[in-house]
């Protein structure tokens, strides 16, 4: 991941705003604060982005290399099956859950985990780089 201009001025890492990190054609924001799932989603939308939707195992692996043990909200919910916010199914990874009330998804360096949507966690936003 290539850090944005707040952290680096390298010519090879342009085009993501301050606070954001670049990977491929996308910019990622890793929060410091914690919010519940819906508030994390609203934060991302208010910054013209989306709560993280992961497209494949490669992207997931790369992001997990950057994450710690702390879980971060992603744009994943259990609505008659685990689906990303754009409606696409989760089909490249399993998600660990130990309760039917855990209907929102979070990620850390090791796994995708279901959690109660009211829990306050850090989150990750994603948007197409300018």
């Amino acid at each position: 991941l290539c850090q944005g201009s707040k952290y680096s001025t390298c010519a090879s890492c342009p085009s993501c705003p301050d606070h954001w990190m670049k990977y491929g054609n996308h910019c990622y924001y890793f929060s410091v604060e914690k919010k519940d799932w819906i508030s994390s989603l609203e934060f991302c939308l208010a910054r013209d982005s989306h709560l993280l939707m992961i497209t494949d195992k490669q992207e997931m692996s790369l992001l997990q290399d950057f994450l710690s043990e702390a879980f971060h909200w992603v744009g994943l919910r259990n609505n008659s099956g685990w689906r990303w916010e754009d409606g696409s199914p989760l089909n490249f990874s399993r998600i660990y859950s130990n309760s039917l009330v855990q209907t929102c998804g979070a990620i850390n360096k090791n796994s995708l985990q279901a959690s109660s949507c009211e829990v306050s966690l850090q989150w990750v936003c994603k948007k197409v780089s300018p």
């Epitope: 604060e33 919010k35 519940d36 819906i38 508030s39 609203e42 934060f43 939308l45 013209d48 306050s120």
Partner: antibody
Amino acid sequence: QVQLVESGGGLVKPGGSLRLSCAASGFTFRNYAMSWIRQTPGKGLEWVATISESGNYNNYPDNVKGRLTISRDNAKNSLYLQMNSLKAEDTAVYYCVRDDWEGRAMDYWGQGTTVTVSS
Amino acid sequence: DIQMTQSPSSLSASVGDRVTITCRASRDIGSSLNWYQQKPGGAPKRLIYATSSLDSGVPKRFSGSGSGTDFTLTISSLQSEDFATYYCLQYASSPWTFGQGTKVEIK
């Protein structure tokens, strides 16, 4: 320094309309989500609307949805609140506020503009 | 919605006093709490964010603590310019909600 200056408040009859404006300066307006907060003697401080950096996304609490519309013009560094079908309970001081980038709610507030809904 | 209950609603104190204001959330909000100061006829000004971090330019006599559901704003030695109304705000869960305010008056 960050400055937010509201205008457009006044006396309006129930059912009427009003458009509030907020002129922003001292920061890169297009890089911040913005909100309106109102304050009444009865209900205290209450969030009423948020708009994304580009203006493509709006968010409202249920009690104002459909009556209040937030918008912005990044070329003019301006934020707006269109208020329709006004009710007596909309009487308040309305503040234009900047959202803290890291998600810690609002960091800077304007001085406010007063809206009075009365017949 | 999360309810924020502030206490006391008002208090009288003298210059130099130590003042403590508390805010209780109806459910766990972690450390997602701000404190604002509002003087008569003015706008709220953020003093503290994320429970305990002071905004730039805010005197060090102001401090915040707590986590989960119980939070405290402390003014270690009250000054004349501190007589105002103080509000807490939670931003862990949408919609953002404020406490009803604590008015700090001169004894």
